[in-house]
């Protein structure tokens, strides 16, 4: 849960109670045990462009 009074994390990041800051969800691929990764599973990833044929 995000600490009171802090701004919400930007898209593609999630709050880490262990570090008291927003962390990039991309790092959860390498280290899924991190506490903030649970929040990443609930949030959509950062937007990316679909490349159509």
């Amino acid at each position: 849960e995000q600490a009171p009074g802090t701004a919400p994390c930007s898209r593609g990041s999630s709050w880490s109670a262990d570090l008291d800051k927003c962390m990039d969800c991309a790092s959860c691929r390498a280290r899924p045990h991190s506490d903030f990764c649970q929040g990443c599973a609930a949030a959509p990833p950062a937007p990316f462009r679909l490349l159509w044929p």
Epitope: A3, A17, D18, L19, D20, A30, H33
Partner: antibody
Framework: EVQLLESGGGLVQPGGSLRLSCAAS????????MIWVRQAPGKGLEWVSY????????HYADSVKGRFTISRDNSKNTLYLQMNSLRAEDTAVYYC?????????????WGQGTLVTVSS | DIQMTQSPSSLSASVGDRVTITCRAS??????LNWYQQKPGKAPKLLIY???SLQSGVPSRFSGSGSGTDFTLTISSLQPEDFATYYC??????????FGQGTKVEIK
Amino acid sequence: EVQLLESGGGLVQPGGSLRLSCAASGFTFSPYPMIWVRQAPGKGLEWVSYISPSGGSTHYADSVKGRFTISRDNSKNTLYLQMNSLRAEDTAVYYCARGGDTYFDYFDYWGQGTLVTVSS
Amino acid sequence: DIQMTQSPSSLSASVGDRVTITCRASQSISGYLNWYQQKPGKAPKLLIYQASSLQSGVPSRFSGSGSGTDFTLTISSLQPEDFATYYCQQSYTSPFITFGQGTKVEIK
């Protein structure tokens, strides 16, 4: 110069309590995660406990869970370890250490350690 | 829990020797591996972080390599001040970290 100075160790009987302190200086204490690590005589290093920069998140090794409490006072630049229900196997040198500034991947500064002896 | 196993547990070497210490994790830890040096009666000192990054102020004769489960600390030319015990530490499961049992480097 970054310094971490532990105190509070000593001889205590089994079942007794001690409170260790780790005074930080030479850096801004509040943004850094901190840990306690211990080393039994002639043995290797064992992680004991972790605390987040604000103190809102704490973690413990199974061997001390329910008996030890980690805390910090950022206004005093001090880390604490309250040790209750002490056992002979808790006898060790206890070190505090500072986590890295971007994550807690590594611990770049350590105190000199304080010896805790649990014996009757 | 992830177990870290170092080998050898001790070694004898001479000044100028190239020394290699290995650390094996019980499961993949990617590159989240640190190395520390500890001298008798002193606190551990960070040498290498994230498998291969040299901590500021550490001599360049120390180097680290590896990823996944197998890691190596190399001292290219052993100096008198390098006789100590070396520990690996995994941070893949941070803040629940674990250390290897240590490797003691002694004078031959």
